[in-house]
Interface confidence: low
């Protein structure tokens, strides 16, 4: 047999850890211009703005609403043409800046403000872009809540409103002196119009380990929080198990007098399927890829580099994260490509569920990125690389193994052919992809965020939702709003879509729009007129204004799209790269809606537009609190202006609808909810660049196909004849606020 | 503090043509847009045209009455704007305002006005 | 385009009364309103924007609110110096439009 004798297997060596030195890989030297702000440069940027806004600067860590705190600072990206003399003119780099959002609580007219600082490392000037930017100071209102406002809004809850209805909480849900087996679900927007501040919170058992979203006690507290004094704060409607109610007091008072009817919801602690702690003991060790070689690309701070590709990556603070100066062998295919929004839209039988429209980049896809867990959220043998920030703070802090980098394996031919006609042979090549990924927990949902570079020339852009539903509780006729996952428990349907901004530059800046298609076109059949043919044809179109190129949600698409160059390839046409959705997403938001233009990306599964220094990003940090007057309006951006030989930018939405089922407990799975869409040659190349990839296999069938020098599969005994060195398990830990 | 001032106004044939300035100071004109709008003797108003500033490519727009005879410009350099209207008629006897947008849509400054007569 | 329908067109009213004008949109525009006070041979002037903010300098007895599609401005106690036209204007989309307006005098 080939099992060997039964003995003691023989030490293989440890297969390297780094790559080969001889890698015709390169890692340009501008990699600093698209990198995120170091601790250090964080670190000067917060004592340059200490310096310059004075002692009246609170930590954001413990700011009131009525005090000035610097809310975040981030990369102030370098305008586009500045970068691009840098990079392929070799004009001296564009100043490295910072941008700092700042809160003015205390003073007559409170408002936010944006300053850009700069030049990094050693800040001497401050400019505020809040007019030139937005056209007017922002409202104080927009701001987005600080962790310190939540802390005061649980003082306000647990301590001074929950005792008014100490009975009633008793008898449903086992209160204890101010409500400590509680917790409370923020929602969003907070209210019904611009320049609201009043935030309906859901209360949960707490469930220490397990999923608290699981478990609503039917109480809902709507907070009034818009004014700057926390202690004139209020409650201005209160939902108990379906009814309304004005107060906590008149709650207890309707429990006393026996005409509340109340439910009894068990706190049934961690032991249930809401847990994440399998009843199963471990098993064999699933699947490892290894690197037998060494990995076969680099990463050099933000800068990732492979035989193939090129490319910087980063993570907004709040939209998330991003990738600049794609190249593909050398050549640049993508200036930028960033998410820049997400949305979850919620229906359901309580004001919580009905209202929710959770604009995440209001909270913040890069705040809330999550450390990686080695060996689930990535391969076990991936790069992790971390993510200085300083957001809510007066110091950086570091999110650890905030992203991951590694090559895999599709276990999937890329392309393939197996011959028995005429003549014998096999040519095929196994897609290995590189691939970058960072992950984010808003609430009780995680986000999974995936670049997919091909052998193929292709990008591939895939976000997944997994983590806990958000729930309700389950009373009245709930079959419109979700499906029932527990006794007392309402899966709510919701639906979640992102926002992709993709600057492609295909064979250079000055891009057109081709739109192709298929018809069938009726004709006789011209050895035989008396019979017709349906014969499928070809339809193009150059689209030469924005409107034309702006495809609403459930609009006929067509379904191939590129932006194309001037330039043709060898066999006379356009050089071009098309945008291939994959998306299911449900029904926007109705325009008559007074919120919808908080989030107007939502409509248009795609748009291209002319690319503006002005409009970096179809959404804001400001857009969640207040969605009624938004500060980014995407549907702005589309006013019918040519797109015939510009710079372009595709904006592409990516979604899904989601009802709730048993399966999605403890949580919902990626299988089936990841969408997104691919960037892919067409005509871009002269044929599939992959043929010239050195992991190419092809033999005749006279050939000796197990001969090391004929089929390079054959060599792997002994090339790959190592073990991979495993390093020990680490956790990024948790973060405490 | 914001000042704006209207000139160019008077009586004009029917068919004939006018050119409206409007000089400003006061404020930092490149941060805004600026806009016309006229009110008819003893009318209401009627927005008449706009023009944002160089951050949105100087883009321009128009109420649908003048459309095609009316074009508005400004001059960052002596934060000034102007309106051209060609064809003019009758029913254009106006007050023409010059004002600021803040916030992008609302008109916080007026000018005092000048007026426009078209008569034969 | 979004019609703008203001009522009354005209009013009278005693100092130190209340007074009420209401301006009906023709389609959803949010929050998206401002209301304009012209005093005779005078040019306009913002009071209140996004329906319910006012203006700097503005004094607190005016105030705006919204239901739906229609919106009120409201003079808690009518002074001489309020005495002109008031104007509201529809900024969600353009063409931007005004109401006809309403011509408030003293009783």
């Known amino acids: 047999g080939r099992g060997g004798d039964g003995g003691e297997p023989s030490q293989l060596p440890h297969c390297p850890s780094v790559s080969p030195s001889a890698q015709p890989w390169t890692h340009p030297g501008q990699s600093q211009l698209f990198a995120d702000l170091s601790r250090e440069e964080l670190t000067a940027v917060m004592r340059f703005l200490t310096q310059r806004l004075g002692p009246g600067l609170v930590d954001a860590a413990q700011a009131r609403p009525s005090d000035n705190c610097v809310f975040s600072v981030e990369l102030q990206l370098p305008p586009k043409a500045a970068a691009l003399a840098h990079l392929d003119r070799g004009s001296p780099p564009p100043a490295r800046e910072a941008l700092a959002i700042v809160f003015f609580g205390r003073q007559p007219q409170p408002n936010v403000s944006e300053l850009v600082v700069g030049p990094l490392p050693h800040p001497s000037y401050m400019r505020d872009v809040t007019v030139e930017r937005h056209g007017g100071p922002l409202p104080y209102h927009r701001r987005p809540v600080l962790f310190q406002e939540y802390l005061d809004i649980d003082q306000m809850i647990f301590n001074r409103e929950l005792p008014q209805a100490s009975g009633l909480l008793h008898h449903c849900c086992f209160y204890k002196h101010r409500g400590r087996n509680l917790v409370t679900m923020t929602t969003a927007p907070r209210g019904l119009q611009s320049g609201d501040r009043a935030t309906w919170f859901g209360l949960y058992y707490n469930i220490s380990g397990a999923g608290f979203f699981l478990h609503h006690v039917g109480l809902e507290l709507l907070v009034n929080h818009k004014a700057l004094d926390p202690a004139r704060w209020t409650i201005q409607k209160v939902f108990y198990q379906g009814r309304y109610y004005d107060s906590l007091a008149q709650l207890e008072a309707q429990f006393e007098a026996g005409l509340v009817n109340v439910v009894l919801i068990p706190d049934n602690g961690t032991g249930g399927s809401w847990s994440l702690k399998s009843p199963v003991p471990p098993g064999p060790a699933p699947p490892l890829q290894f690197y037998p070689q060494g990995p076969r690309f680099s990463v050099q701070g933000s800068r990732v580099a492979s035989s193939l590709w090129t490319f910087s990556f980063g993570l907004g603070a709040f939209s998330g994260p991003r990738i600049f100066d794609v190249r593909f062998q050398g050549e640049r295919l993508v200036y930028e490509i960033s998410l820049q929004e997400a949305l979850a839209i919620y229906g359901g039988n309580s004001p919580a569920a009905m209202t929710t429209r959770y604009v995440d980049g209001g909270f913040g896809m890069g705040k809330y990125t999550t450390p990686l867990t080695r060996g689930v959220d990535c391969p076990y043998l991936a790069t992790y690389v971390d993510w200085h920030f300083l957001l809510e703070s007066q110091a950086p802090k570091t999110i650890r193994d905030a992203f991951c980098v590694f090559e895999q394996n599709q276990g999937l031919p890329l392309r393939r052919h197996h011959s028995d006609l005429y003549s014998h042979y096999f040519g095929g090549l196994a897609e290995t992809v590189l691939v970058v990924r960072s992950m984010s927990t808003l609430l009780n949902y995680d986000y999974v965020w995936d670049t997919v570079f091909h052998p193929s020339g292709a990008i591939e852009i895939r976000f997944y939702a997994t983590g806990y539903i958000s729930s309700a509780f389950l009373f009245g006729a709930t079959g419109k709003y979700g499906n029932q996952v527990s006794e007392h428990t309402l899966g709510t349907v919701h639906t979640h879509s992102a926002h992709f901004k993709v600057d492609l530059d295909v064979a250079g800046l000055e891009n057109w729009v081709w739109a192709e298609d298929m018809v069938f076109v009726p004709m006789a059949v011209p050895w035989s007129p008396e019979h017709q043919l349906q014969r499928l044809q070809v339809t193009r179109k150059l689209l030469e204004m924005e409107e034309q190129a702006a495809f609403l949600v459930g609009s006929a698409t067509p379904r191939y799209l590129y932006l194309a160059s001037n330039h043709s390839n060898k066999w006379g046409h356009p050089r071009g790269y098309r945008i291939q959705m994959l998306s299911f997403a449900g029904e926007p938001l109705p325009q008559n809606s007074s919120m919808a233009r908080g989030f107007s990306w939502e409509r248009y599964q795609l748009a291209v537009t002319q690319r503006k220094e002005e409009e970096p990003s179809s959404s804001s940090v400001f857009n969640q609190n207040d969605p009624w007057a938004p500060t980014v309006d995407f549907s702005d951006f589309i006013n019918n202006e040519t797109i015939a030989g510009k710079d372009l930018v595709a904006w592409v939405t990516a979604g899904f609808l989601h009802i709730p089922h048993a399966e999605d407990i403890p949580n919902t799975v990626t299988v089936g909810n990841g969408v997104g869409f691919f960037l892919r040659p067409y005509n871009f190349f002269d044929e599939d660049p992959s043929f010239y990839s050195a992991d190419s296999i092809y033999f005749r069938g006279d050939q000796d196909a197990g001969a090391c020098e004929v089929n390079p599969l054959a060599c792997l005994p002994q090339a790959a004849a190592c073990a991979p060195d495993l390093p020990a398990f680490s956790h990024g830990g948790f973060s405490h606020n | 503090e914001v000042q704006i001032l209207e000139t160019g106004g008077g009586l004009v044939k029917p068919g004939g043509s006018l050119r409206l300035s409007c000089a400003t100071s006061g404020f930092n004109f490149n941060d805004y847009f600026m806009n016309w709008v006229r009110q008819a003797p003893g009318k209401g108003l009627e927005w008449v045209a706009q023009i944002r500033n160089k951050h949105y490519n100087y883009a321009t727009y128009y109420g649908e009455s003048l459309e095609g005879r009316v074009t508005i410009s400004r001059d960052d350099s002596k934060s000034n704007v102007y309106l051209q209207v060609n064809s003019l008629r009758p029913e254009d006897t106006a007050i023409y305002y010059c004002?600021?947008?803040?916030?992008?849509?609302?008109?916080?400054?007026w000018g005092p006005g000048t007026m426009v007569t078209v008569s034969s | 385009d979004i019609q703008m329908t203001q009522s009354p067109a005209s009013l009278s009213a005693s100092l130190e009364e209340i007074v009420t004008i209401t301006c009906q949109a023709s389609?959803?525009?949010?929050?998206?309103l401002a209301w304009y006070q012209q005093k005779p041979g005078k040019s306009p002037q913002l009071l209140i924007y996004d329906a319910t903010t006012l203006a700097d300098g503005v004094p607190s007895r005016f105030s705006g609110s919204r239901s739906g599609t229609q919106f009120s401005l409201k003079i808690s106690r009518l002074q001489v110096e309020d005495i002109g036209i008031y104007y509201c204007?529809?900024?969600?989309?353009?063409?931007?439009?005004f109401g006809g307006g309403t011509n408030l005098e003293l009783k």
């Open positions: 389609q959803d525009i949010g929050n998206w």
């Open positions: 204007q529809q900024a969600s989309s353009a063409p931007w439009t």
């Open positions: 004002s600021r947008s803040s916030y992008l849509r609302y008109f916080d400054f």
